[in-house]
Every structure is written in structure tokens, then in C-alpha cells.
């Protein structure tokens, strides 16, 4: 009896694992083995596919074959008993195009109100993704074990910290990788669960902000208790992208080590141009807080996010404020090529009651003023990028008197 060729050959590639599956064409014939050949582009001869010769099952693994993953290959299969079937040719394919990204490895660390997630590619030193290691991004789904309500977090890197969690609560999560440059979305990791710790005695510092004053950066934060010391550390933001490396060498800012105030001042030349992460920790001598939320600090934006310059045109019941580009030391305007929001604070000169206006426009009307009254105005700029969330310092206050009652038109 002539042996029939196997049919429906499927090639599954996950990371560096190459698996072939096929259907027996004739279940009634026993003791049949199967063998594969492969052929590279531009070659005429077929080569035996190692790992896939004389296979008794309907699955084989040819991961040991060192292929150029960007080069098209063709496969063929036949059945063998005393005689052999004809070859069945599989459509040619390029391994890289066919490959799926496998589940990443996940390592969790718990604090009282935060979880640190370390993510590594599922296959260490993968050949398939050798040129794409730094391009991996990850997304995760996290939920409280007790509720099951899922939250999705997209576009994270190999280290991510989730804040504002509840103490002594079990959270579960799963992570998948993506190579957006190749339109590839991976498969989810197994579910990992971790319980946050009991609430720490000392909370972490909050509301960290960086501003520029003269040639210095001023770092400010809020803290619940008095008589504390603080330390500040920085890390190059790009290091969070480094696959497989989970040793993060946070560095001290020398002028911000063991400071007793909720701010510290350090020279701009501490940082070269770049994007950094900053974090603050509090200590009372006996106990130490966990680190604050990490804020992103871009020297380019920070250095040039100067307070706005503005002119006031006074009417009887309002001010018209015209915001211009801030001036550098040489009186040349700074070009700010990112969108800004302006915060304008104004108050009656004789009062402390401040009112605030937030505007995207550079011409702003301050309404409902009293005639012949001195009002003071100061302004600052904010970036509109949520992730950067930077603010300039306030401009110096400018005080003007409103006109008499009949000049409002």
C-alpha cells in the first residue's frame, strides 16, 4: 500500500523554540515515522532537518538548528515505513516574521503600598530577538485577588513600580511583551501574586517637584512629620529599559544627602543633558520610609522651562495679560517648542486672598476686578505632558492699578 504524505503542517515559533506539528494522513497504518528536509533561499539542495528525522509522533523540535532568522526557508515532510510517501512541501516562511514573543519572566517585590515589577525576556540571550532587546515594551494586567477588577497598564519597561496600593493585600498580575517596531504582541506570563506588607511606620515623601533658580535645581517635597532627615537619589531613566539587568545603581545627589529640610538645592552641572528618575527617602534615625514615587526629570525641559514674561493692560474691572517667551540672560527670547499651560495667580495688594486662572492661551483676561485698586500678578508655566509634569518657578510679581470706573469698554 502506498503511504500518503502527511498534511496540515504547522510551524510554531516562540522565541527561540521551533516546533513542527502535522497530521497523519492515514491513522490505520502503524509504525510510521516522519522526516523533514529544509532548504534555504537561493539553494537547490535539500538538507535533513536535524531533530526531525524518523519521528514516531506528530511533533518535533528543530530549535538546535542555527538558522538566520531573517532568511526565508522551506520545509518538506514525508512518511516512512518500508517505503516512503511523496514529499509534502510546506509554504516557505521567514522565522522572524513567524515568531511569537514568549511569556516574559516576572519577579515581584512588595512594599506596604507599592509593588516593584522586574520583567525579563522569557528566553535569555535570545537569537530571535537579538537585535530587538532594547525595543521590548511590556503591558500588564493587575487585580486585587479579592475583587478581580482588572487594571491595565501599557508601555512599561523592564522595571516598573505600581504605587497607591493597599497594605496587607494580595495583588495578582500577568505580563506580556510587545515589539511595536515589528507589530508583535507576545503571550501573557503565568499569573504572579504577591501580598503587600503591613503599613510602614513612616510614609514616603510626596509631591516631589524640581524647579530652576539661577544656576541651581531646587528639589522640593512634602512630608507628614517634622525632625526628619532625607536623602535623594537619581538614576538614568534609560536603564529601566535594559533587558535582563535588574541591578539599578541609584546614585546619591551629594547636596541632598541627610538634609533636614523638605528641599535641597544642587548645581545644574550635577546632571548632564538627559532624562533621569529622582526619588526621596525619609528617616527619623530609627526608622526609614520606603522610597517616594519616582519622578521623571528631563534636564532639557527643566533647564528651559523658565517663568513666563508678561505685560499687563489695565482696565477698570479687568486686566488683559499678554504672555511672551521668557528671556535668557542675554535678553533673547527662549523658544519653547512644547505646549505649555499657564497658571496665573492674582491678588489684591492689601490682601492675602489669592485667585488662580489656568489658561492655554497667551492672552488672558483677569475679570471681576475693582476699579482704582492695586492688584498683583505672578505666573508660571507647566508642560502639558502628563508623564513629565514639569513646572517653572513663578515669575516675579507685577503690581498694577486698575483704571477708574468708566474705562471698561
Amino acid at each position: 500500500k502506498n503511504l500518503k504524505s502527511p498534511q496540515k503542517v504547522e510551524v510554531d515559533i516562540i522565541d527561540d523554540n521551533f516546533i513542527l506539528r502535522w497530521n497523519r494522513s492515514d491513522e490505520s497504518v502503524g509504525n510510521v515515522t516522519f522526516s523533514f528536509d529544509y532548504q534555504k533561499t537561493g539553494m537547490d539542495n535539500w538538507i535533513k532537518l536535524s531533530g526531525c528525522q524518523n519521528i514516531t509522533s506528530t511533533k518535533c523540535n528543530f530549535s538546535s538548528l542555527k538558522l538566520n532568522v531573517y532568511e526565508e526557508i522551506k520545509l518538506r515532510i514525508r512518511a516512512e515505513k518500508e517505503n516512503t510517501s511523496s514529499w509534502y512541501e510546506v509554504d516557505s516562511f521567514t522565522p522572524f516574521r513567524k515568531a511569537q514573543i514568549g511569556p516574559p519572566e516576572v519577579h515581584l517585590e512588595a512594599e506596604d503600598k507599592a509593588i516593584v515589577i522586574h520583567i525579563s525576556p522569557g528566553t535569555k540571550d535570545s537569537v530571535m530577538w537579538a537585535l530587538d532587546g532594547l525595543s521590548f515594551t511590556y503591558s500588564l494586567v493587575i487585580w486585587k485577588n479579592s475583587s478581580g477588577v482588572e487594571e491595565r497598564i501599557e508601555n512599561i519597561y523592564s522595571r516598573h513600580k505600581i504605587y497607591k496600593l493597599s497594605p496587607e493585600t494580595t495583588y495578582c498580575l500577568k505580563v506580556k511583551a510587545a515589539l511595536l517596531t515589528s507589530w508583535k504582541i507576545g503571550v501573557y506570563s503565568p499569573v504572579h501574586c504577591i501580598k503587600t506588607t503591613v503599613e510602614n511606620e513612616l510614609p514616603p515623601p510626596e509631591n516631589i517637584e524640581v524647579s530652576v533658580q539661577n544656576q541651581n535645581y531646587v528639589l522640593k517635597w512634602d512630608y507628614t512629620y517634622a525632625n526628619m532627615t532625607f536623602q535623594v537619589q537619581w538614576l538614568h531613566a534609560f536603564l529601566k529599559r535594559n533587558p535582563g539587568n535588574h541591578l539599578y545603581k541609584w546614585k546619591q545627589i551629594p547636596d541632598c544627602e541627610n538634609v533636614k529640610t523638605t528641599q535641597c538645592v544642587f548645581p545644574q552641572n550635577v546632571f548632564q543633558k538627559g532624562i533621569y528618575l529622582l526619588r526621596v527617602q525619609a528617616s527619623d534615625g530609627n526608622n526609614t520610609s520606603f522610597w517616594s514615587e519616582e519622578i521623571k526629570f528631563d534636564t532639557e525641559i527643566q533647564a528651559f522651562l523658565l517663568p513666563p514674561v508678561f505685560n499687563i493692560r489695565s482696565l477698570s474691572d479687568s486686566f488683559h495679560i499678554y504672555i511672551g517667551a521668557p528671556k535668557q540672560s542675554g535678553n533673547t527670547p527662549v523658544i519653547q517648542d512644547y505646549p505649555l499651560i499657564y497658571e496665573i495667580i492674582f491678588w489684591e495688594n492689601t490682601s492675602n486672598a489669592e485667585r488662580k486662572i489656568i489658561e492655554k492661551k497667551t492672552d488672558v483676561t483677569v475679570p471681576n476686578l475693582k476699579p482704582l485698586t492695586v492688584y498683583c500678578v505672578k505666573a508660571r508655566a507647566h508642560t502639558m505632558d502628563e508623564k513629565l509634569n514639569k513646572s517653572s518657578v513663578f515669575s516675579d510679581a507685577v503690581c498694577e492699578k486698575t483704571k477708574p470706573g468708566n474705562t471698561s469698554k
Epitope: 512594599e111 506596604d112 546614585k251
Partner: antibody
Framework: QVQLVQSGAEVVKPGASVKVSCKGS????????MHWVKQAPGQGLEWIGR????????KYAPKFQGRVTITADTSTSTVYLELSSLRSEDTAVYYC???????????WGQGTLVTVSS | DIQLTQSPSFLSTSVGDRVTITCKAS??????VVWYQQKPGKSPKVLIY???YRVSGVPSRFSGSGSGTEFTLIISSVQPEDFATYFC?????????FGQGTKLEIK
């Protein structure tokens, strides 16, 4: 494979100094932290300090601050522990260890016995 | 400095027994705890890191758990090669500190 090989045993007099070395191979020391740990005879482990060989930044346990110096020579992949003003309670085995992923001291040297005796 | 207190300091046990060693921290260290095994005349060897992650190559009879201030190392069925001293260590804050050790002896 990763290896940390330490210098040989030392017998030194009280008040003197000693410098112990630890040579790493199978990895780039600049990518890691390098730690030193003390173990007195029959006692537990005490962390002395660590260095980041990439920029020579050091951290010391307050107990050892001022009397120990940790340095690194990246050209020879070697880190050093210098102990000064030695006294009898400094008699111990000193271990170097690599600080790797998740800040774990994952590989340790074989230890160097320093005996302080007059 | 963060104090770590291990208990018991000595433990006599037999092959096949289940053993539990605890480590208490004087303040919350998250899950930043490492467990080491040390045999006489040898360097310490990492068994467990980040409280519960077993190092590759360490037998599955070793497991770690806990968070905050209380941590546990369990050996589910003690083998002859497990008789050694075990140390916990916190890596949450400098200076790193170790527990005083638990010596596991043959009964």
C-alpha cells in the same frame, strides 16, 4: 564562569594596616557592586561596605566607617579592602561578594583570614 | 541600623524532618530578604532572594516566605547535605545586616 579569587591569609600586628584583594573573572566588575563581609571566628556575618567599580562610589557600615577603605581597579578587575589601625577583634575571615541582580550577593570569594596578633 | 533576629539559634533534627527557621526584622523591609547557607570552612551560598525566589540549582525542598518584618525559611525534608548554618540578610537599606545565624545539627 563567574569566579572571585581572594589574596592569601595575613598575620599582622595591632595598629598596623592590611590590604586584601579580590579578583573577579567571568564578568565585568563595572556592571556590578562589589561587597566586603566580615566573619569573626565562630561568629556570624557582618556587612562592611560596597563599591560601585564603575565610578568608585562607596557605602560603608557606620561601624567600619573611617577605618576601612574599599577601592577598585577596573583594569585588573580587582577590588581591595584596606583595614587600618588593626586590633585583635579585627581577626576574622573577610569575604568579597558580587552584588548582582536584585542587589543579591550572588557569588562569593573563598575568604581571606586576617589574624591580628602581636 | 535594621536588626535581624533569627530563631532558633541551634536546631537538632533528623534526616527527613521538616525544618522552619524564622527571621524577624526590627522594621519593615518589604520583601528584601535573602537566605544563605554556609558550611564549615566554606563561603556562604545564596538559597533564596527577595523573600521567596529560589536560586536556580537550589533543591525545591528549600522555600522562603514572608514580608514586612517576619520571614521564614522552610526545608521540607532535611537531607544529610543540609546540615549547615543558615543566615538571613536584609537588602532594603544600607547598612545591609544579617541575622545571627541558625545552626542545623544532626540529632
Amino acid at each position: 564562569q563567574v569566579q572571585l579569587v581572594q589574596s592569601g591569609a595575613e598575620v599582622v600586628k595591632p595598629g598596623a594596616s592590611v590590604k586584601v584583594s579580590c579578583k573577579g573573572s567571568g564578568f565585568n566588575i563595572k556592571d556590578y557592586y562589589m561587597h566586603w563581609v566580615k566573619q569573626a571566628p565562630g561568629q556570624g556575618l557582618e556587612w562592611i561596605g560596597r563599591i560601585d567599580p564603575e565610578d568608585a562610589e562607596t557605602k560603608y557600615a557606620p561601624k567600619f566607617q573611617g577605618r576601612v577603605t574599599i577601592t577598585a581597579d577596573t583594569s585588573t578587575s580587582t577590588v581591595y579592602l584596606e583595614l587600618s589601625s588593626l586590633r585583635s577583634e579585627d581577626t576574622a575571615v573577610y569575604y568579597c561578594a558580587r552584588g548582582g541582580n536584585f542587589y543579591v550577593m550572588d557569588y562569593w570569594g573563598q575568604g581571606t583570614l586576617v589574624t591580628v596578633s602581636s | 541600623d535594621i536588626q535581624l533576629t533569627q530563631s532558633p539559634s541551634f536546631l537538632s533534627t533528623s534526616v527527613g524532618d521538616r525544618v522552619t527557621i524564622t527571621c524577624k526584622a526590627s522594621q519593615n523591609v518589604g520583601t528584601n530578604v535573602v537566605w544563605y547557607q554556609q558550611k564549615p570552612g566554606k563561603s556562604p551560598k545564596v538559597l533564596i532572594y527577595s523573600a521567596s525566589y529560589r536560586v536556580s540549582g537550589v533543591p525545591s525542598r528549600f522555600s522562603g516566605s514572608g514580608s514586612g518584618t517576619e520571614f521564614t525559611l522552610i526545608i521540607s525534608s532535611v537531607q544529610p547535605e543540609d546540615f549547615a548554618t543558615y543566615f538571613c540578610q536584609q537588602k532594603n537599606n544600607y547598612p545591609y545586616t544579617f541575622g545571627q545565624g541558625t545552626k542545623l545539627e544532626i540529632k
